[in-house]
């Protein structure tokens, strides 16, 4: 079979007229009357059908011709390419061969990212138009007027420095800082020994160079400098005027402290949120806290705080804050965190909820105070639902159950255990799943339409019977479900038995929404319309 | 899927009381989504709605028939019935049973759906 | 009670015909009205529900509109098939009442 075959990688300047030569294998030989070769360019928006010319079987050179796309957004487009022969019989191309269209001053404003360009592009940088260009598009008089990257010796004038991160870090050093800007040298070996922050010298990390564009450097030690802050300068090579830059924004050197822990207490196995309030905590490029020697697990922080989640304590009792943001250690005897015992449940009441929870359950236990965010867990046909928690002292905290509601599963008239019950509280595991409880899940109530087409018509001082089942669980003990009817968004007077809610519905008339609500579950089973005891005398 | 069958004499004499029994097959008359209704069609006329019934037994009839009807449901055995007493002449027709879905609309309310599924009709005939 | 009035009370059209059938309720009934469509000697069966939403099972070419008191059934292509007799009925307020029937008839 014809086939186009691999070379070396083709690249087209935009607007440069150029042959292109491809190797090939089995290229057949036009006949008399047969249509020669020619080379498709599937440029998008522009594509470009171009004579080809073919040497011998193995052989092939689109003849000269010049190629463009539009826009400048792009620096470089590899575009697809296919050889016809005889006017539509397209040669093999299995490598998926491309020509590659590129524009150097596509996204190369600046001197140091024309000279990063690859170098098969062989882009360079017109001083005087201060372009980036091929050579032949720059008029330039002598060579040093256009800079290409493989003269060893290139190097871009005027470096900028556009952002500093992070802007402040402790005088202690250590702080990682990221100079991002333009021109900052081509090779790491042109900013090796020229970072400094004021007179701290910054030294440089070769992995975390970007040529021209990034330098990450290690901010020394400025404990014996008395300036606070700081410019940063960057030299590349040498520090003459045009191969220096200085920081618009000052880095400061500041001295990080603490003085607050909040909560001030949690539960011994740990995962507590704590806030430490302080001063410039977000110096630096790193930070980590440990609890009572182990490691607290970092989140967030800004100046004024650093939030993180508490590790499993060793004992109960007090333990130290150490805070090290990069080479500053910071402790503050006066600030510790107490570990309590963990909370223990003693008894959960009632011990039973509806499919849709809700329900008020009173749990008593004791360090339940230890833990600021308790959550009730349930779950139930593999669906799993939280509620919070309100704690009033350390034994007694209040609940709403979880909803169990899942379309897989629901629970018998007689009730069901949930698959599992207990408490998200910090990383107490022992409390998330309670073998202990009897704890049991009763379906909602039922309740009947108020007719069938939704309406029903009443006369005023009748009282509205709701008719339906499991309204009243048949739990053990005396605690009953606690309804609420509105008629409209005023609540009636209710008696609640096993089929029925007898409702005294209030001094209402016209059209009004019923809804019946007990714990998470609400229902509307219709709308009632109350006619005025005038309308009911006329004739 | 749900089929209803009327049953019941197709002559009853004037002044007695006409008894009719829907058989429900092909789903429960339990559920909660359902009324399930009687209409009749006296011959040549249109359709008059007789009442309907929810599987608790709450009942809703036609005011005009009101005095003379009742309907009653028989869960274990998936039927409901028609009871209609001192018939005339007036009251031969065919007699339809009916399925009355209650939908839930938008926040667990319920709107009116439509008879959508009915029984072939039983005629019935009023005559000495 | 709420009365509805149907008209015409019979057609007859061609196949290929667009039918409309028109039905007005004695008093404000939302979008609370079915059509149903009744073939000699067998039950009614529901076409349109709530004004205009499609039962399962019906062809396209059957549609309801309105609300409030005046309510528009259409066939917009009239097959052989569709000679029957067309009923609205209202679920509003009880008592459920019907129109007095279109008969549709093919020519």
């Known amino acids: 079979c014809p086939q186009i075959l691999p070379s070396t990688q083709i690249y087209v300047p935009v607007g440069v007229v150029k042959p292109i030569t491809l190797a090939a294998r089995n290229l057949p030989q036009p006949q008399s009357g047969q249509r020669g070769y020619e080379c498709l360019f599937h440029i998008p928006g522009s594509p470009a059908r171009v004579t080809a010319l073919r040497f011998n079987s193995s052989s092939l050179q689109c003849q000269n011709s010049s190629y463009s796309y539009e826009g400048n957004d792009v620096s470089d487009l590899p575009v697809n390419l296919s050889v016809v022969w005889n006017g539509n019989f397209v040669i093999d191309n299995p490598q998926n061969i491309q020509a590659h269209l590129y524009k150097c001053p596509a996204l190369r404003e600046s001197c140091g990212l024309c000279l990063k360009a690859d170098p098969r592009f062989e882009c360079g940088w017109c001083v005087a138009e201060r372009r980036c260009s091929l050579r032949h598009h720059c008029a330039a008089d002598t060579p040093a007027s256009w800079m290409h990257a493989r003269h060893g010796s290139s190097r871009c004038t005027d470096p900028k420095i556009l952002k500093l991160s992070p802007e402040t870090g402790p005088r202690q050093g250590g702080t990682r800082l990221t100079i991002t800007g333009e021109n900052l040298g081509l090779r790491f070996e042109d900013v090796r020994l020229g970072v400094r922050v004021g007179k701290v010298l910054c030294s440089p990390v070769e992995s975390e160079y970007i040529s021209a564009e990034q330098i990450v450097c290690e901010i020394g030690d400025a404990s014996s400098v008395r300036a606070h802050d700081a410019l940063v300068e960057v030299c590349v090579r040498d520090c003459s005027p045009h191969y220096r830059a200085l920081s618009p924004k000052r880095f400061t050197f500041v001295t990080p402290t603490f003085y607050r822990v909040s909560p001030s207490r949690g539960p011994l196995s740990g995962g507590t949120w704590i806030g430490i309030e302080g001063s410039h905590l977000n110096a630096g490029s790193d930070v980590a806290v440990s609890v009572g020697g182990r490691p607290c697990s970092f989140s967030w922080r800004n100046s004024r705080e650093i939030r993180c989640l508490t590790p499993p304590g060793q004992s109960p009792g007090s333990a130290p804050i150490i805070i090290n943001i990069n080479r500053a250690q910071l402790t503050n005897p006066e600030v510790k965190y107490n570990y309590t015992e963990d909370p223990t449940i003693l008894r959960i009441d009632p011990e039973w909820s509806i499919n849709s929870g809700g329900t008020l359950l009173t749990v008593t236990g004791t360090n339940l105070a230890t833990v600021r965010e308790p959550r009730i867990r349930a779950k139930y046909g593999g669906i799993e639902r939280e509620n919070g928690c309100l704690v009033y002292n350390d034994t007694t905290m209040v609940c709403r159950a979880p909803s169990v509601a899942n379309p897989v599963r629901s629970p018998p008239e007689l009730g069901e255990r949930p698959d599992e019950l207990g408490f998200v509280m910090d990383n107490v595991r022992s409390l998330l799943v309670l073998n202990s409880t009897s704890f049991l899940y009763y379906p909602d109530p039922v309740l009947e339409p108020l007719s069938p087409t939704g309406l029903l018509e009443l006369k005023p001082s009748s009282p509205l019977i709701l008719k339906g089942r499991n309204l009243l669980p048949p739990a053990p003990g005396n605690s009953r479900l606690n309804y609420t009817v509105l008629i409209g968004s005023t609540p009636c007077t209710l008696t609640v038995s096993e089929t029925q809610l007898l409702c005294e519905a209030p001094n209402l008339t016209g059209q009004h929404k019923v809804t019946v609500r007990a714990g998470g579950f609400e229902f509307s089973p219709g709308t009632l319309q109350v006619y005025s005891d005038s309308l009911l005398t006329l004739p | 899927q749900v089929q209803l069958q009327e049953s019941g004499p197709g002559l009853v004499k004037p002044s007695e009381t006409l008894s009719l029994t829907c058989t429900v097959s092909?789903?429960?008359?339990?559920?909660?989504?359902?009324?399930w209704g009687w209409i009749r069609q006296p011959p040549g006329k249109g359709l008059e709605w007789i009442g309907s019934?929810?599987?608790?037994?709450?009942?809703y009839y036609n005011p005009s028939l009101k005095s003379r009807v009742t309907i009653s449901v028989d869960t274990s055995k998936n039927q409901f019935s028609l009871k209609l007493s001192s018939v005339t002449a007036a009251d031969t027709a065919v007699y339809y049973c009916?399925?009355?879905?209650?939908?839930?609309?938008?926040?667990?309310?319920?709107?009116?759906?439509?008879?959508?599924?009915w029984g072939q009709g039983t005629t019935v005939t009023v005559s000495s | 009670d709420i009365q509805m009035t149907q008209s015409p009370s019979s057609l007859s059209a061609s196949v290929g015909d667009s039918v409309t059938i028109t039905c007005q309720a004695s008093?404000?009934?939302?979008?609370?009205l079915n059509w149903y469509q009744q073939k000699p000697g067998k039950a009614p069966e529901l076409l349109i529900y709530?004004?205009?939403e499609l039962h399962s099972g019906v062809p396209s070419r059957f549609s309801g509109s309105g609300s409030g008191t005046d309510f528009t059934f259409t066939i917009s292509s009239l097959e052989a098939e569709d000679a029957a007799t067309y009923y609205c009925?209202?679920?509003?307020?009880?008592?459920?009442?019907f129109g007095q029937g279109t008969k549709v008839e093919i020519e």
């Open positions: 092909g789903g429960s008359i339990s559920s909660s989504s359902y009324y």
């Open positions: 008093q404000d009934i939302s979008s609370y």
């Open positions: 009925g209202q679920g509003n307020r009880l008592p459920y009442t």
């Open positions: 009916a399925r009355d879905p209650v939908q839930l609309e938008h926040s667990r309310y319920y709107y009116y759906y439509g008879m959508d599924v």
């Open positions: 019934i929810y599987y608790s037994g709450s009942t």
């Open positions: 709530y004004g205009s």
